[in-house]
Interface confidence: low
Amino acid sequence: FERTRSLQDPCSNCPAGTFCDNNRNQICSPCPPNSFSSAGGQRTCDICRQCKGVFRTRKECSSTSNAECDCTPGFHCLGAGCSMCEQDCKQGQELTKKGCKDCCFGTFNDQKRGICRPWTNCSLDGKSVLVNGTKERDVVCGPSPADLSPGASSVTPPAPAREPGHSPQ
């Protein structure tokens, strides 16, 4: 790397991936192994994040960008930049201090993370329960009992939600 020539701050010419080395008369030196600088003009390089243990490398470190982590199978990310990994549970369960526990009656969880939530109270909307809830699924509300008088049209349950990325057939 050439010696920087800026009259104001000689370090301002040091590009990302380098640091302004005071020990070498402010020459721009490459970041040492396992470190990076994502912006120019830095006087030090930052240590790369290591994704160890329950963390898994999603994107490797380079001289200009930090590593990005996610979680190993059976865990999911929590916090900014996946600062923590939390254990997955099965659908119909929630994570407690004592591990994964089944949802109590009247609650459900349709994901591998998060807490059990109460079933929808259909009667609050003046509707009736069309399909009972389970530990994994919320109840499905139908029309109010009054709407089911003789001659009323048959009830069509809502279409199941599609998985992301799946197009209609």
Epitope: C31, P33, C51, T57, K59, E60, S63, A67
Partner: antibody, heavy 117, light 110 residues
Amino acid sequence: EVQLVESGGGLVQPGRSLRLSCTASGFSLNDYWMSWVRQAPGKGLEWVGYIDVGGSLYYAASVKGRFTISRDDSKSIAYLQMNSLKTEDTAVYYCARGGLTYGFDLWGQGTLVTVSS
Amino acid sequence: DIVMTQSPSSLSASVGDRVTITCQASEDISSYLAWYQQKPGKAPKRLIYGASDLASGVPSRFSASGSGTDYTFTISSLQPEDIATYYCHYYATISGLGVAFGGGTKVEIK
């Protein structure tokens, strides 16, 4: 299935060029360093060079200026362009996925390059 | 560039024996060390990374340790399928200071 497959090896005369390809499947090529490693017949492993996630290129002194690594993320292929080949470049060439955390965790099956007149 | 000196270059041991291979770096490599197994005609297979972490699916008879410049790889009870060449590998090369492999250790059965 997560895998790497090399191709493009063969017999080439000294001074000529050859391009090797490394086709990745089951993962995103630009999320990893991609390295090339070679092994001369009956010898040990020798690192050739790599391209990091930011696109920076690094080469072993023995190939610097003659070999070029590149990457086509849309095709999920890494390339090793070898120019001015020498007889001592004769080796099985492996591409490997690697990086700071895990070392080289995935290798291709290798492709043989023979440089001979 | 960092130089990795691996020893011995070859060894012969009996089935069930404990086998130890050492690797010395020319400078502190901060545990950025992997160990690979290579069988004839095959690509290397990673066994260990981070100096001591066992890669998934690798039998527990393989282990490794070390820090700074000195590293050790151990097969606690040699099996016939362990016949191969083993390499140590320094892999932290962000600013191009060079990936370095050890010279290899060929392990044979007596």
